[in-house]
Each structure stands twice: as structure tokens, then as C-alpha cells.
Interface confidence: low
């Protein structure tokens, strides 16, 4: 599923991401834009043999099990395929664990490079939330 900007903002708010660990909703929508272009089925291969999955591009070396990543920790205790669902519950729950891990949203390279320090509220402007 490819979400619309406001559609995703509403879904993320419903799942409790607004101001989760101090990160406003705009941060999460911005991260999703630059990680996956709002596509729940996005997958991207990394040079270390791991793969990033879903709307927030969650990594198989640490957070989910895809059965093919050497030394995978599966800290969210889910199959990576769950992160590709049009229902973003699994991605949100895992993202909450990631953002609580010490580095905050710096765990998402796209957020660090494209969203951090920018006007992230622009990503929810005009949305009925």
C-alpha cells in the first residue's frame, strides 16, 4: 500500500506516534517519506547482507527476522514480512522500540539527513488529524 501523506499522518497518530519519545508526528511522516516514499512494501538491500523493510525501512540485522540475515537479533520479535503489511501496526510497534533504544530517531539515516532540523510540521500541514 502506498499511503497518502495525510492518510499516513492520521494512521500514525492513531497508533500513538505523535510526540512518542518527544518526536512530533511530522518527524515520523517525514521519515516515512524519505525512507520508503510512503510505500509499505518497500524493501532495500544493504551491503552487509541485511535488508530494510516497510514504510519505516526497519532493518533485519537488528529488529526483525527474515530468515536470511547472518547474526540477526530480531529485537522486535517479528518476521520482517509483517513490516510489509498495509496495516502499519507492526512497523509502528517496532519503531517505538527502536526510537527508545538510545539514539532516538537518529537510527533512521533518512531522518537524520533529510528531516532533522527542518520544518517537519510541513509534513502534516493541512491534514485533518
Amino acid at each position: 500500500k502506498v499511503f497518502g501523506r495525510c492518510e499516513l499522518a492520521a494512521a500514525m497518530k492513531r497508533h500513538g506516534l505523535d510526540n512518542y519519545r518527544g518526536y512530533s508526528l511530522g518527524n515520523w511522516v517525514c521519515a516515512a517519506k524519505f525512507e520508503s516514499n510512503f510505500n509499505t512494501q518497500a524493501t532495500n538491500r544493504n551491503t552487509d547482507g541485511s535488508t530494510d523493510y516497510g514504510i519505516l525501512q526497519i532493518n533485519s540485522r537488528w529488529w526483525c527476522n527474515d530468515g536470511r540475515t547472518p547474526g540477526s537479533r530480531n529485537l522486535c520479535n517479528i518476521p520482517c514480512s509483517a513490516l510489509l503489511s498495509s496495516d502499519i501496526t507492526a512497523s509502528v510497534n517496532c519503531a517505538k522500540k527502536i526510537v527508545s533504544d538510545g539514539n532516538g530517531m537518529n537510527a533512521w539515516v533518512a531522518w537524520r539527513n533529510r528531516c532533522k532540523g527542518t520544518d517537519v510540521q510541513a509534513w502534516i500541514r493541512g491534514c485533518r488529524l
Epitope: 547482507g49 536470511r68 547472518p70 518476521p79 514480512s81
Partner: antibody, heavy 116, light 107 residues
């Protein structure tokens, strides 16, 4: 237990297309990549590519782009590989395997013969 | 693409002998190297994963070692059921590649 059951041997004419199936049982089909491997006598084993059934995401060996197309039907836990514009070079045994980086589980192989 | 070179191409041994098969990678692949056995008209069977971990159900006479570019599969006291082809495969990068194989035959 994990099993991969491939479709039977095929004899095809040059220029035709063929679709090989691989039915998976004994595990969560959507969670693991299905790999496809070609074996020709004297040519060893060649990795064709892979599909993640849960998303339909595919990765192809550059050498097989345009030759092989992967699909998966999650309702029947079956992966498919279509080979197009067949030539004698495509005559081989084709295996599906469950992708774990290494391949612990393999299908029994499908023998494809391309002959006029 | 990473090339895997196996040697020797053929190894003739007597049951009871101990043997070593080599697999060399064209660039470093850490420990992401796996070994398979294949008998005539059968599918490959995983023996060793990640260079040194025996797969489930594999007898202890099979062992693997190596890291980086040089890897070895050792069979301690070969049994008659061990004869066949042996392939290495890397999972360090895409495309996945296999070695050309070593044929283990009875002398």
C-alpha cells in the same frame, strides 16, 4: 517439516515460455525468500534470483534479467518462475530453495529440455 | 561478482582416508561461505553454514574452517556415502555465487 515440491519435467520448443512451480509447506511462506538456482552439466550451479512472497519483492542476477520472472501466490504457498524466449542454453535442472543466506531446504528440481 | 574457485576439481580417495577441499573467494567474504554435497540426480544438501557451523543432521566427520578468502571443508575418514560433488557458495553479496565444484570419487 519444511518441504519444497517442484513441478514436473518439461520439454519445450525454442522461442516458447515455461512456468515452473515450487509449492512450500511446513513453514510461514511469506517470511522467507524463495531462491531459484540453475544447474547445467559442466556449468555448476548458478543463482538466478529470489522473491519474498509476502511482498512480491524480487531480486535478479543481472545475467537472468529478461529471461526469468518470479511470482508468488500466498493463498496456495506457491512460487513460480517463468522463463521466456527459450533456447537450448536454457536446458537445465532448475531448483527452488528456501533462502536463509545458505540454502538448507531445496526442491527436487525441475528438468527443462528445450528442443525443436 | 564474487568468484569462488574450488580445488582440486577431482579428488580420488579410498574410504577411510581424510581429505580437505579448498574454496577460494576473489575478495573477502568474512565467514559467509557455505558447503553443499550433491549426489547424482539429487538436490544439493547443506553440510556447513557460515564457514564452520555444521548443518542439522550432518555427521561430525564433516568440518569447515576459514575466513576472508580461504576456506576448507574437511572430511575425517571418508565413508562410501560421502562420494559425490561438493560445492561452496557465498552469501556475502549479490548475486549469490557458487564454486565450480570438487568431485570426490573412489580410487
Amino acid at each position: 517439516q519444511v518441504q519444497l515440491q517442484e513441478s514436473g519435467a518439461e520439454v519445450m520448443k525454442p522461442g516458447a515460455s515455461v512456468k515452473i512451480s515450487c509449492k512450500a509447506t511446513g513453514y510461514t511462506f511469506t517470511t522467507y525468500w524463495i531462491e531459484w538456482v540453475k544447474q547445467r552439466p559442466g556449468h555448476g550451479l548458478e543463482w538466478i534470483g529470489e522473491i519474498l512472497p509476502g511482498s512480491g519483492s524480487t531480486y535478479y542476477n543481472e545475467k537472468f534479467k529478461g529471461k526469468a520472472t518470479f511470482t508468488a501466490d500466498t493463498s496456495s504457498n506457491t512460487a513460480y518462475m517463468q522463463l521466456s524466449s527459450l533456447t537450448s542454453e536454457d536446458s537445465a535442472v532448475y531448483y527452488c530453495a528456501r533462502g536463509d543466506g545458505h540454502y538448507c531446504y531445496w526442491g527436487q528440481g525441475t528438468t527443462l529440455t528445450v528442443s525443436s | 561478482d564474487i568468484e569462488l574457485t574450488q580445488s582440486p576439481a577431482t579428488l580420488s580417495v579410498t574410504p577411510g582416508d581424510s581429505v580437505s577441499l579448498s574454496c577460494r573467494a576473489s575478495q573477502s567474504i568474512s565467514n559467509n561461505l557455505h558447503w553443499y554435497q550433491q549426489k547424482s540426480h539429487e538436490s544439493p544438501r547443506l553440510l556447513i553454514k557460515y564457514a564452520s557451523q555444521r548443518a542439522s543432521g550432518i555427521p561430525s566427520r564433516f568440518s569447515g574452517s576459514g575466513s576472508g578468502t580461504d576456506f576448507t571443508l574437511s572430511i575425517n575418514s571418508v565413508e562410501t556415502e560421502d562420494f559425490g560433488m561438493y560445492f561452496c557458495q557465498q552469501s556475502n553479496s549479490w548475486p549469490r555465487t557458487f564454486g565450480g565444484g570438487t568431485k570426490l570419487e573412489i580410487k
